[in-house]
């Protein structure tokens, strides 16, 4: 099932998935001056079965001749660097497809693709956070978020990560102000069924890849 919301935003951090579950959509977004062809695919879809998954549909961008009738707010360089979705300078392929059945790898870039990728994730997807360059991590727990199904609604767990500027004098991790979870309650208080498909396999992979997950993108 598709997750209702996007993963949580952590100030000065970006997130990344190591592999994408079947049913994940990647929107066909184009860089400035280009647009998705009118009758082209809206998104690529991770599809397949438990033994083999791949991305369906092709994204195609064409030169944008349409006049701009929207009021544009151009992000400042700092904002662009900290956009929450993965920036695709070089697509990372950390996981061999065979090692995560029912998952797709990072799809290759397409011509004139936008600088950030917009995914629609599905229940059970895990994403990993890292502070952007110039900020360091204060951990209180795992810097990851999982889309879970609780009481028939989807929600993302709150990653336990705070990114602080290198020059700032930071508090000890124990003194940090806790970041409010959207639900405002710890998971232990919920007693109904939580869908946890594929968490374990991804967590195990995370343990071996945690140190190298972002190296190809943020050097």
């Amino acid at each position: 099932e598709l997750c209702d919301d996007d993963p949580p935003e952590i100030p000065h951090a970006t997130f990344k998935a190591m592999a994408y579950k079947e049913g994940t959509m990647l929107n066909c977004e184009c860089k400035r001056g280009f647009r998705r062809i009118k009758s082209g695919s809206l998104y690529m879809l991770c599809t397949g079965n438990s033994s083999h998954s791949s991305w369906d549909n092709q994204c195609q961008c064409t030169s944008s001749a349409t006049r701009n009738t929207t009021k544009q707010v151009t992000p400042q360089p700092e904002e662009q660097k900290e956009r929450k979705t993965t920036e695709m300078q070089s697509p990372m392929q950390p996981v061999d497809q065979a090692s995560l059945p029912g998952h797709c790898r990072e799809p290759p870039p397409w011509e004139n693709e936008a600088t950030e990728r917009i995914y629609h994730f599905v229940v059970g997807q895990m994403v990993y956070y890292q502070c952007v360059q110039g900020y360091r991590a204060l951990h209180r727990g795992p810097a990851e978020s999982v889309c879970k199904m609780t009481h028939g609604k989807t929600r993302w767990t709150q990653p336990q990560l705070i990114c602080t500027g290198e020059m700032e004098t930071s508090q000890f991790p124990g003194e940090e102000k806790p970041q409010a979870s959207p639900e405002g309650r710890p998971e232990s208080e919920t007693s109904c069924l939580v869908t946890t498909t594929d968490f374990q396999i991804q967590t195990e992979m995370a343990a071996t890849m945690e140190t190298s997950i972002f190296t190809t993108e943020y050097q």
Partner: antibody, heavy 114, light 107 residues
Framework: QVQLQQSGAELVRPGTSVKMSCKAA????????IGWVKQRPGHGLEWIGD????????DYNEKFTGKATLTADTSSSTAYMQLSSLTSEDSAIYYC???????WGQGTLVTVSA | DVVMTQSQKFMSTSVGDRVSVTCKAS??????VAWYQQKPGQSPKALIY???YRYSGVPDRFTGSGSGTDFTLTISNVQSEDLAEYFC?????????FGGGTKLEIK
């Protein structure tokens, strides 16, 4: 929570125009196109067009070219649709839709009557 | 434009039954098909995307299938709250088009 909140019902005169709004909340407005759909009893659902607030481009169903004008204001995360030269054929419920069809607004009822 | 045909305007079923709503496209649309449920006085609710994938909060008794030109929405173990109109939509080519709808009546 992702929401699309549409403006209230409109009773308008033939020949005039009307502008309705769709305010997005709970997601990054500039990341997703917003589409508009017309529903009239006995005529089903019709796609009017869509606008990408981030990319700034707009597509119209040819049937609605000249009838509908789509705009968006990124500062208020609001999309707008203006309908001009209204006739009784334009009496309908109009929906905005976003996030790859997953989210629909509650609809705006437009009644064209003298 | 691609024409989406839902040949059955009305379907009658009983609670606990299994029912299939069909939709035929006038040309190949791949799997770029969505299904919606609309209850009286409400806006359409997205059920299925890419012909067979469920949106969040959609009970697993709703399943979509098909590709190319023939598509089916199956509701197994029909519940009284499934009383609604069901629409298919193609988004393979512009303008995106909808089927005329199938009203599900509960006996």
């Amino acid at each position: 929570q992702v929401q699309l909140q549409q403006s209230g019902a409109e009773l308008v005169r033939p020949g005039t125009s009307v502008k309705m709004s769709c305010k997005a909340a709970g997601y990054t407005f500039t990341n997703y196109w917003i589409g508009w759909v017309k529903q009239r009893p006995g005529h089903g659902l019709e796609w009017i067009g869509d606008i990408h607030p981030g990319g700034g481009y707009i597509d119209y169903n040819e049937k609605f070219t000249g009838k509908a004008t789509l705009t968006a204001d990124t500062s208020s995360s609001t999309a707008y649709m203006q309908l001009s030269s209204l006739t009784s054929e334009d009496s309908a419920i109009y929906y905005c839709v976003s996030r790859n069809f997953a989210k629909w607004g509650q609809g705006t009822l437009v009644t064209v009557s003298a | 434009d691609v024409v989406m045909t839902q040949s059955q305007k009305f379907m009658s079923t009983s609670v606990g039954d299994r029912v299939s709503v069909t939709c035929k496209a006038s040309q190949n649309v791949g799997t770029n098909v969505a299904w919606y449920q609309q209850k009286p006085g409400q806006s359409p609710k997205a059920l299925i995307y890419s012909a067979s994938y469920r949106y969040s909060g959609v009970p697993d008794r709703f399943t979509g299938s098909g590709s190319g030109t023939d598509f089916t929405l199956t509701i197994s173990n029909v519940q009284s709250e499934d009383l609604a109109e069901y629409f298919c939509q193609q988004y393979n080519s512009y303008p995106y088009t909808f089927g005329g709808g199938t009203k599900l009546e509960i006996k």
